[in-house]
Amino acid sequence: TLNSVLNSNAIKNLPPPLGGAAGHPGSAVSAAPGILYPGGNKYQTIDNYQPYPCAEDEECGTDEYCASPTRGGDAGVQICLACRKRRKRCMRHAMCCPGNYCKNGICVSSDQNHFRGEIEETITESFGNDHSTLDGYSRRTTLSSKMYHTKGQEGSVCLRSSDCASGLCCARHFWSKICKPVLKEGQVCTKHRRKGSHGLEIFQRCYCGEGLSCRIQKDHHQASNSSRLHTCQRH
């Protein structure tokens, strides 16, 4: 069943040992159950690929998004699906492949001339009690009149950090995502203590730059857990 996929976390197809011949089986591992796809056919393993269950886009690969595999199916059962290419239908930015974003329900290139106004950004409503669904997805809201500047510059609307110029990352700002500077030494950073807690941030910070990590500031070790200040520090 679909639910059993979410409960399974054994490695499904071990690769051959280092130096081993292709096709040589590894250690015994659990088999993944099939998954039902549109049309009702059971998903069979193709080239050893098994659907990867997920709860949010960040669990998937950079060219994937997390969604229910069936239209109108169980919204609680989601897997990583291949991103949608240009001109394909979409409901939110993460569905579109890198270099594209979702506009009016279609994936369009974000690599166009200097400036584009009036992009429409579909977002998942994180708050409120209305959990109505459309094709198994959470209800979305549209924000218009966002400005899209030259690709990758600070303040540009983005989908992933790879859309931003060097030294910038893609981080949430209100309910959109824009390119923000990667944090430098001494700057305050965010450490997520609870799983998924970053989903509640409306002013998300970038990660720390190369050679830095987000650690508790030395003079804040004695402070209470809730008031601990993290900063980017050298290793």
Partner: nanobody, 129 residues
């Protein structure tokens, strides 16, 4: 310089426990999967366990499921492998490794050693009967 340094190995009796630790330095590994592999004398290196870059999703080879637990602490840039109910066949050099978030993720991604960019020098675990 990027470094992964393992510690916590040693000699333990069958049925005993050990806790391996891997400390990362030189870059942030928040967007990397962290894994443990092992290599016994005269054998190929094999996958043991991995933990994803998001939501701490864990993966294990069947032979260690229920006995080993992998965890990570991004605040300290460390990954741990808690090993209990150890058996003589668990004797090996244990390596910590880091794999970047791929374009497409699959269960087999985590167990494929060639996906791991950074490797530690290893720590010896010996389980006596």
């Amino acid at each position: 310089e990027v470094q992964l340094v393992e510690s916590g190995g040693g000699l333990v009796q069958s049925g005993g426990s050990l806790r391996l630790s891997c400390t990362a330095s030189g870059r942030t590994f928040d967007n990397y999967a962290m894994g443990w592999f092992r290599q016994a004398p005269g054998k190929e290196r094999e996958f043991v366990a991995a933990i994803s870059w998001a939501l701490s999703r864990t993966h294990y080879v069947d032979s260690v499921k229920g006995r080993f637990t992998i965890s990570r602490d991004n605040a300290k840039d460390t990954v741990q492998l808690q090993m209990s109910s150890l058996k003589p066949e668990d004797t090996a050099v244990y390596y910590c490794a880091a794999a970047p978030r791929p374009k497409r993720v699959s269960f087999s991604y985590f167990s494929t050693s060639s996906n791991y960019e950074y490797w530690g020098q290893g720590t010896q675990v010996t389980v006596s009967s």
